[in-house]
């Protein structure tokens, strides 16, 4: 039952004389294990014997013994799955059909495999993509329908007979599906590879040549161009002629169109391989190339830089930066179109040639006001000297210069005057827009830069102004030197340091805090009476009569100032004591009599003592002694004593006469 035998193996195997064949093979005998295996070469079925005739290359018996001549052929299989075979070496006459006769206990099967052995190693086969374009990576494949474990081989790639630098990837297959050796090479062909021969060479393990396959590369590429120019350096002067020729060194496929480009832009009506430029102008300077197209795309030549030389054009000056702030740095750049580039420059400031400045740039590290003005330049090259352009204006900005505060008033200024000051400056850029004044006051500014101080104070010492544009510049302060009458005049007691007692030596000082002008005169006055003209008023021995209200005056050429009235107080013991009697010194008995102790004392009497004609002190201590009712016995002489902090004083005797009333006399 043939359906029970299933085989898998390559249909045909290829080799050459002296190589080997490895035949991968699998099978399935469904009714049991393999008992007998014979490998026939070109088997023929004999109907008479119902057996196969042919050369027996290999035979296995039930006892597993193999005849010695069968060493060349090896069955590498097993009794139920593997039927792999090896023939090593293989010979030319091994070509044909191999028959694998398989027998199990109950079934038989003949499996046929084709073997193709050539006399010499057969060539590999190179496979190329359908189209190859320059710079596009392609894979070249070299395939050989051969692989055998006992016979190592290698595939090498050559370009024009020279081994290729690119690394190839070699793979082998020895499976029931296929037997081959393959080499793959990744390669980015360039246009120059077009028409070149690529070879895949089969070599043995020692690198000995066995066979090869060759192909000619057909690399599609854009046209490759060469540009030639007359004159060869492409440097001409205005009015000269120039010829450019475009040559196609390679194109695949053939080219179709030609054009010329200048600075990347196509030139109209220029569709031949020669470009003629007659009487060139400087505008024709630039980068020229030719462009030729084919089906792959456009190809461009290298660029030719055509330089049309001319004398410098009128120059312009660029200033970095204007306006410039004083002290900053500034650079001038002379710009002039010229070919070749200018080699020499002449600079002008306000129309005057600046000596020593011959470079394209003028650098000023620290700008000063005098640098301001118009700068122009002239450029020069081998073809001539350009013209001076309009120039550029350098504006140098700086704070107001030489600022001064000026007093407009006639001098001297007196306290209370109206003072006018002006703020002056020498120069300023930009213009002064405002002014500042120090110190600040409630003063009016009738016009810009003018300050009016009404009723100027004695203490307005200095004033400074600032003139301001973008910056403020302060003037040195100016002294107003205001003249005024002496100030803060006051009387000051110099001695004694303590309170003034009668008899003391006393000195009073007339003080003042300030005076302008400094030259002063003094006057002392008491109750409108002039006492002296010195700064001090002296009393050798002060008396109570000197007490009173004193003033001093200090005057200068501006005016005079009086002190506040100063009270001079003299302390003294009670004096001029006397006893006064009321209603009189003769009083009728029974009436009332009042005795008063009058005195002159400073400070006032604090304590009184009364005495009678016997110098007996009476038990009374107030200023008044009241006798009520008065008796005749009260008649007699009385005196009093007054005491203050300075001392004591006593009065003379005063006699009180008390007479009898008419009633008393009537009773007598």
């Amino acid at each position: 039952d043939s359906s029970k035998w299933v085989f898998e193996h390559p249909e045909t195997l290829y080799a050459w004389e002296g190589a080997c064949v490895w035949i991968p093979c699998t099978y399935r005998a469904l009714d049991g294990d393999l008992e007998s295996f014979i490998l026939f070469h070109n088997p023929e079925y004999n109907k008479n014997t119902s057996k196969f005739d042919g050369t027996r290359l290999y035979e296995s018996t039930k006892d597993g013994k193999v005849p010695s001549e069968q060493k060349r052929v090896q069955f590498l299989g097993d009794k139920n799955k593997n039927c792999t075979l090896s023939i090593h070496p293989v010979h030319l006459n091994d070509s044909g059909q191999l028959g694998l006769r398989m027998e199990s206990k109950t079934e038989k099967w003949m499996e046929r495999i084709h073997l193709n052995v050539s006399e010499r190693p057969f060539p590999p086969h190179i496979q190329l993509p359908p189209e190859i374009q320059e710079s596009q990576e392609v894979t070249l494949t070299c395939l050989l329908n051969f692989s055998c474990y006992g016979y190592p081989i290698q595939l090498q790639w050559l370009l024009e007979g020279v081994p290729m630098r690119q690394a190839a990837v070699t793979s082998t297959s020895l499976t029931i599906k296929s037997v081959f050796t393959r080499s793959e090479l990744k390669f980015s062909p360039q246009w120059s590879h077009h028409g070149k021969i690529v070879t895949c060479q089969l070599q043995d393990a020692d690198g000995k040549f066995l066979s090869n396959d060759t192909v000619q590369l057909n690399v599609k590429h854009t046209p490759k161009l060469e540009i030639k120019v007359t004159p060869s350096d492409a440097i001409v002067r205005e009015g000269d002629s120039v010829t450019m020729t475009c040559e196609v060194s390679s194109s695949n496929p053939e080219y179709t169109t030609v054009s010329w480009l200048k600075d990347g832009t196509s030139l109209k009506k220029q569709n031949t391989f020669t470009l003629n430029l007659r009487e060139v102008t400087k505008d024709q300077s630039g980068k020229y190339c030719c462009q030729v197209s084919n089906d792959v795309g456009p190809g461009r030549s290298e660029e030719v830089f055509l330089q049309v030389q001319y004398a410098p054009e009128p120059s312009t000056v660029q200033i970095l930066h204007s306006p410039a702030v004083e002290g900053s740095q500034v650079e001038f750049l002379c710009m002039s179109l010229a070919n070749p580039l200018p080699t020499n420059y002449t600079w002008y400031h306000n129309g005057k040639e600046m000596q020593g400045r011959t470079e394209e740039k003028v650098h000023i590290p620290k700008i000063l006001p005098w640098h301001a003005g118009t700068y122009s330049c002239v450029a020069e090259n081998i073809l001539g000297t350009g013209q001076r352009g309009p120039g550029a204006e350098l504006d140098v900005q700086y704070p107001p210069k030489k600022v001064t505060t000026v007093i407009q008033n006639p001098m001297p200024i007196r306290e209370g005057d109206t003072v006018t000051l002006s703020c002056n400056y020498n120069s300023s850029n930009p213009s002064v827009t405002r002014y500042e004044w120090k110190p600040h006051g409630a003063w009016e500014e009738p016009s810009l830069g003018v300050l009016k101080i009404q009723n100027v104070g004695w203490d307005n010492t200095t004033i400074a102004c600032a003139a301001c544009n973008s910056w403020c510049s302060w003037a040195s302060p100016v002294a107003l030197n205001v003249q005024y009458a002496p100030r803060d005049v006051r009387v000051r007691k110099i001695k004694p340091l303590s309170e003034i007692h009668s008899g003391n030596s006393v000195s009073l000082q007339c003080d003042f805090s300030s005076s302008h002008p400094k030259e002063v005169q003094f006057f002392w006055e008491k109750n409108g009476r002039l006492l002296g003209k010195e700064s001090q008023l002296n009393f050798d021995s002060i008396s109570p009569e000197d007490a009173g209200s004193y003033s001093c005056w200090v005057n200068n050429s501006i005016g005079q100032t009086a002190s506040k009235a100063w009270t001079l107080e003299v302390l003294y013991a009670p004096r001029r004591l006397r006893v006064s009697m009321s209603p009189g010194d003769q009083v009728m008995e029974g009436k009332s009599a009042t005795l008063t102790c009058e005195s002159d004392a400073n400070p006032p009497v604090s304590h009184y003592t009364w005495f009678d004609w016997n110098n007996q002190s009476l038990p009374y201590h107030s200023q008044k002694l009241r006798l009520e009712p008065v008796k005749v016995q009260h008649s007699g002489a009385y005196w009093c004593q007054g005491t203050n902090s300075v001392g004591k004083g006593r009065s003379p005797l005063s006699t009180l006469t008390v007479y009898y009333s008419p009633e008393t006399i009537g009773r007598r």
């Epitope: 040639e353 020593g356 000023i364």
Partner: nanobody, 122 residues
Framework: EVQLVESGGGSVQSGGSLRLSCAAS????????LAWFRQAPGKERERVAT???????SYADSVKGRFTISQDNTKNTLYLEMNTLKPEDTAMYYC????????????????WGQGTQVTVSS
């Protein structure tokens, strides 16, 4: 007040050398030009060489390669080194100064020295 005093003039044979000095005092300009001028009898005063405060130098074509202008700021002195002297270099040599750029015309210079005579005989 700026004062310029020249020295170093004298008589020399053709091909000889001289060194002129100019002592400057009272100079307070920020940004200035110092120059040497010369005046031959009966001729206009002409610029010989200039140097500005940034060190930029310029020479008259007739003296290029033979004369060298220099300044010593520490000594406030201007120099003119004159080599390969020719009879046509005979003139009174003046030191001049101005605040600002160096110009070629003598009228642009506000300060002048009294001059020093250079005589070159053949």
């Amino acid at each position: 007040e700026v004062q310029l005093v020249e020295s170093g003039g004298g008589s020399v044979q053709s091909g000889g050398s001289l060194r002129l000095s100019c002592a400057a005092s009272g100079y307070t300009y920020r940004g200035y030009c110092l120059a040497w001028f010369r005046q031959a009898p009966g001729k206009e005063r002409e610029r010989v060489a200039t140097i500005d405060s940034d060190g930029y130098i310029s020479y008259a074509d007739s003296v290029k390669g033979r004369f060298t202008i220099s300044q010593d700021n520490t000594k406030n002195t201007l120099y003119l080194e004159m080599n390969t002297l020719k009879p046509e270099d005979t003139a009174m040599y003046y030191c001049a100064a101005r605040g600002g750029w160096c110009y070629s015309l003598s009228k642009e210079y506000n300060y002048w020295g009294q001059g020093t005579q250079v005589t070159v005989s053949s």
